[in-house]
Structures are given as C-alpha cells and as structure tokens.
Interface confidence: low
C-alpha cells in the first residue's frame, strides 16, 4: 500500500475533477474569452504568467482542434497542460481577471470534453508521458529519461538554479539569498513533486543555538519508466555511495541509469545525477558534519502542488524570519568596534581560547581570499566553535557553487549595505559590508559554561 | 502483497528481556526503515524508535534509550526489538511498522501486533 | 501527557462532517511538512489515512483531508459513515522523536 507520489508532468492533487460528459456549463464562450485575454492585457510587466499559459494553450490546439471538436486525448492533454501551467503561476496572480477567466474556463473544458484530471500533457517544455502510475512500460524514446535533450528537442535552455547548505548552517537558496539559521531538528530543504531533501542539525556545542547537519534523507520519487523510488541518507561519520537498498542506480525500470550516485572520495564527497530531472546533488562530510549543495531547473524547483506552504522548504524561501540570525543589524553596531571589545562587552564567555579573532580570519583568509559571504560564514564558525574544519565546509561549499551555478558572475555574494540610500538610488553597486559586523552574532550563540 | 507478521504473544516477569520479531515479506526489505510502536492497554500510540534495515542506523525515542534495541536479519527479512529491565507499565501490544519513504515518515504498513504483558 | 494535543472524542451523525484537531509547538507541527494520521479500529492494528499533512495513500476514500494552520494539524472527514467510527491519532516528526497525538476517538451517532 504504498502510497502515490505525483511525478513529473501529472498534475497535482490540488484543483479539479473531470465530470464526465455534459456535466458542465456549456465552454463555447471561453475560446473568445481567451482570445480577448491574449489580446488585451499587457504582458511585459506582472509576475502572473497566464498569459504565457494562455498562448502555450492556444498555439496547442490551434489548427488540429476546433472549440467543438471530439473529445480526442490531444485536446485534453493540453487541457492538463495548461492547468498545470495555471497552477505553477498561481501564487502571482491572485486577483488577476485574466487568470480567475483561465482557471473556470478550464474547468469548463475539462467537463465538456470528458477530460480526466490525470493523464499525459502536451507541455511543451516537459516531456509529455504517459500518466505516472507505477508503469514499467518501455519508452521507444531515449529522451525521456535526459531532461537535457528533451529541453533541446524543443529549442530550449533550461534555466538552471543552486542551493547549499554548509556550516553552521549558512544557507544559499535558489534565489542566491544567503542566510544563516539555527534551524535545529528536522527541516525539510526541497519538496516537490520529485525530490524531498530533509536535513537533521544538531548543536555544535552543548547549549550552543548553533547548529549545523549531521543528517541528510534524500528521496528520489518513483518516476515513470525512469526511475523507482530511492531513498539515499547520509550521516556524521557515514556516507554512502550507495541507496538505502543498496543500489547505486535509479532501479531496474529502463531508465534506471538516469539516476546515478558516484563517490567522489570515499566517506567524504558523493555526486548524484538525477538526469531525469536535470539535477545534480552534491553532498560532503568535511570535518563532522555535512554539506548539501544542489543544480535544479527552475522548472523543477517550481514543480510544486501547495504554493502555501512554500514557505516550509528552505532552499526556495529560505529560513523562516524567527530561525534567521542577522548578521545586519549586528554590522551596525559593529561598526568601529574591535572584536577583542566586543567579546570583553559580552556578558556571553568568548570562543575558545585556541581561537581568537586574527587566527579565524588567518585561516579563513588562507582557504577564501575573497571577503564574501562564504568568508563571513567562515569566520563566524570558526568563533562560534572553534572548530577549524569548518574553514573546509565554507571553501567546499564555495567550490560547489562554481560548479553548479548557471551564473558565473553570481558565484561570491556579498552582503548589501543598508545605510547608504543615495548609493542605492543612484544606480551604483552595494558595497560589501566589512567583516566585523559578523562577529557580534555569534556572542548570543556561544554556550554558557558554568 | 505487502505483510509484516510479527511473533507471538509473551508474558514477562518484571526485569526481564523481551525480543519481538517482525518478519517482512511482498517488498524489498532493505528499501524501507522498520519504525516500532506500542500501546498500553486502552492508551494511544507510543513510538519507540526506528531502524534502517540497509545500514543498521537506528533512532531511538529519548525515553527508551539503554533499555530497546533494534535489529535487522536481511537474510530473513527479519526486523528484532528488544527491551529490557521490563517494568509492568512496559505491558503493552508492540507493533512494526514499514516507513513509507525516508526514516522519519509515514508507517504504510503495519503487523497485527504483540502482546507483551509484564507481570510478577 | 502527549507532545500532540487533540481532542478526547468528537462526534457526528451520517453523512455530516467532523474534524479533529491536532496542536503542537512550531517544530513539531508548524515547521513540518511529515504530519501523518493513522484509524485504529479496537483490536486491530493503525491504518495510514493521511501523510504529509495532505496527502491520501491510495484506498482511503476521498472523504478523508488533511490541512495545516500555524501549529495545528487537522483531519476532515466529510460525509461521516459508520465505518469511521473508530480512534484517529495524529504523527509528527519533531526534531529526534516521532510523537503521536494522544488520539481522538470518532463517534457516529
């Protein structure tokens, strides 16, 4: 009784039923709708995408299927298609005139034309496949399982997206925001329609709000004729090169080869390839802990049934506002101030005494020559724990990022200065903030010895 | 089909060991984490831990830890919980539960349960 | 004292719709996505009914819902039958420990 997990292009759980036929209004008056939304509302500017959804629609059936033609599985593929291409931009656009018209025309169409609410699409940017139960069903197509060639098959570049998790734990969503959390416990990293990552983290020191990861479960669901479902978990002290079952492959379906896990150096560095959905996987162990980065198709990122609760997932909305330590408003206060003052100020005991401040940025100037965020991150950790191997997981963690981000111009971050409007306002780039101001945060996190 | 069938009823004496069996048949053994379950008579459900049948990893709930430990024999499909120092609040119908996906999710299917009842 | 809070009983008649509460703290309902419920007839074993707060393995009917507001987790069952009647406990993962509520149990009148 396993239960179902949604795969690639079926749609979601969310929305409507087929009705059978006849059991709707009657849908003739929605194709002039549509057609007036293609024509009156301007594009260029709104975050909703109907109107794209409404054109991929409308250049689908355009042609072969007439408003009144048969109930064919063409016209209602489409159909799905473009309800999922609805529900993907639904966030956005709450309110939309053109948008609330979509959506009850499609449930107009779907009931007339008989159209179930599962079945193959004819998205044009997915692979259009049969409907996703657990069939084992050969492709005659290779390309099915290679999200790749099947973006290129229709002339397109997907666009691609990173997240990583290292440290203490500093996290880099999908949208390049970069945030450190505390985050203890169990938290969910990625969960859409085909991959779950949930990390573990775990104080670093007795009494300690920091953390960092000392467990990682990665589920691969069950994906057509690509892939079975594979669990893959990693933690401290143990990582394997290897699925939970002990396969290193996405299974005996015919596409099992589109999922693939290659130990890098044995117990500390493993890649895993999800061709079938364009991803790449990279976790580490460096030191104790363990380091999580990711390449994804924005597509796939988006790929997603309940936008709200959206706000769960780290990589693509980040750390909710109370598990985020702000390194801003201590910059602030920093400003000026030498960090042996800070620390004497504190009430807090320092960081252990192996490790004062020049050390930290010493060996943190040594791995990472550039002052960004993943430098910032570094001093920070070493303060905060006063173990040296984290110097390592902000380097692998910057190492990651030059490998898997699309933009190369975006691989150091740095942090935006809030003071300086006029800067801002004139079109010049923010300046990085100074270090210092990371170290105040870290005095709230250090444990109390007694 | 998919079955866990556990062992028979047992009855202990207040301090002893008990060893409840579990065994797995209709799916791929290794690919799934055993979760263990108990429920003292007329009270709700109680978790007692989990285990990975591929790696032997185990999660233990804080109450119970040194006195259970799970095992797996994956040549017999085979999950094992044991608990001792047994005391009489330990009575209780012990279940095993397959974990849908992941080592912290849903139990998709469980055995019918066994009784261990703690009595001087 | 169960981690989970949910009410001791509800009630309802056929085909009515009944709902049961299940609240906890930010990190074992509120941050979690792996919120499941289990039907436990007596004398028999639970019975996955929802996972992942919404989602329904297949063979539960579709009566059955789950939702999720701030630290409270819910199950609707819409068009209560006789069948139903029976204890219902909510799971959460928080943190280390997988907790259960202490279990409500549904009356049809």
């Known amino acids: 009784m396993q239960p179902p997990r949604e795969r690639l292009v079926v749609t979601g759980r969310a929305g409507w039923m087929g009705m059978g036929r006849g059991a709707g209004r009657s849908a003739l008056g929605f194709w002039p709708t549509l057609a007036f939304l293609l024509c009156s509302f301007p594009a260029a500017t709104s975050p909703c995408k109907i109107l794209k959804c409404n054109s991929e629609f409308w250049s689908a059936t355009s042609g072969s299927h007439a408003p009144a033609s048969d109930d064919t599985p063409e016209f209602c593929a489409a159909l799905r298609s473009y309800a999922l291409c609805t529900r993907r931009t639904a966030r956005t656009c709450r309110g939309d005139l053109a948008y609330h018209s979509a959506v009850h025309g499609i449930e107009d169409l779907m009931s007339q034309h008989n159209c179930s609410k599962d079945g193959p699409t004819s998205q044009p940017r997915l692979r259009t496949l049969p409907p996703a139960g657990d069939s084992q069903e050969r492709s005659d197509s290779p390309e099915i399982c290679h999200y790749e060639k099947s973006f290129h098959k229709h002339s397109a570049t997907p666009n691609y997206t990173h997240c990583g998790l290292f440290g203490d734990p500093h996290l880099r969503t999908f949208t390049d925001r970069f945030q450190t959390c505390k985050v203890q416990g169990a938290w969910p990293l990625i969960d859409n329609n085909y991959l779950n990552v949930q990390v573990t983290n775990t104080p670093v020191l007795p009494g300690s709000a920091a953390t960092a990861t000392s467990k990682l479960t990665i589920i691969f669901k069950n994906f057509q004729e690509c892939v079975d479902q594979k669990v893959y978990q990693a933690e401290m002290d143990e990582l394997p090169a290897a699925f939970v079952d002990g396969s290193k492959n996405g299974g005996d379906k015919h596409g099992a080869n589109s999922l693939k896990i290659t130990e890098k150096v044995s117990g500390q560095h493993v890649e895993i390839q999800a061709k079938y959905i364009g991803t790449t996987i990279v976790v580490r162990q460096v030191g104790r802990y363990l380091t999580f980065a990711v390449r994804m198709p924005e597509e796939v990122v988006n790929a997603v049934e309940d936008w709200d609760s959206q706000g769960l997932y780290l990589c693509l909305r980040g750390c909710p506002l109370n598990q985020q330590i702000d390194f801003q408003a201590f910059h602030t206060n920093a400003e000026g101030t030498g960090a042996r003052r800070l620390a004497a100020a504190s009430p807090a005991p320092t960081a252990p005494e192996t490790f004062p401040y020049e050390t930290a940025v010493a060996k943190c100037k040594e791995k990472l020559p550039v002052e960004d965020l993943y430098y910032q991150a570094c001093v920070f950790d070493l303060l905060t724990t006063g173990d040296v191997n984290f110097t390592l997981a902000a380097y692998y963690a910057l190492e990651d990022v030059k490998m898997l981000h699309s933009n190369k111009d975006k691989l150091h971050l740095y942090e935006r200065t809030r003071d300086l409007p006029g800067r801002a306002a004139a079109g010049l780039p923010l300046a990085p903030r100074p270090l210092l101001g990371a170290l105040v945060p870290l005095l709230a996190l250090l444990p109390v010895f007694c | 089909e998919v079955q866990l069938v556990q062992s028979g009823a047992e009855v202990k004496k207040p301090g002893a060991s008990v060893k409840v069996s579990c065994k797995a048949s209709?799916?791929?053994?290794?690919?799934?984490?055993i979760s263990w379950v108990r429920q003292a008579p007329g009270q709700g459900l109680d978790w007692m831990g989990w285990i990975s049948p591929y790696s032997g990893n185990t999660n233990y709930a804080q109450k119970l830890q040194g006195r259970v430990t799970m095992t797996t024999d994956t040549s017999t499909s085979t999950a094992y919980m044991e608990l001792s120092s047994l005391r009489s609040e330990d009575t209780a119908v012990y279940y095993c539960?397959?974990?849908?996906?992941?080592?912290?999710?849903?139990?998709?299917?469980w055995g019918q349960g066994t009784l261990v009842t703690v009595s001087s | 004292q169960s981690a989970l809070t949910q009410p001791r009983s509800v009630s309802g008649s056929p085909g009515q719709s009944v709902t049961i509460s299940c609240t906890g703290t930010s990190s074992s309902v509120g941050d979690s996505i792996y919120v499941s419920w289990y039907q436990q007839h007596p004398g028999k074993a639970p019975k996955l009914m929802l996972y992942d707060v919404t989602k329904r393995p297949s063979g539960v009917p579709d009566r059955f819902s789950g939702s999720k507001s701030g630290n409270t987790a819910s199950l609707t069952i819409s068009g209560l039958q006789a069948e139903d009647e029976a204890d219902y406990y909510c799971?959460?993962?928080?943190?280390?420990?997988?907790?259960f509520g202490g279990g409500t149990k549904v009356t049809v009148l």
């Open positions: 209709g799916y791929t053994f290794t690919s799934h984490g």
């Open positions: 539960a397959r974990v849908g996906s992941g080592p912290y999710y849903y139990m998709d299917v």
């Open positions: 799971c959460s993962y928080a943190g280390t420990d997988t907790l």
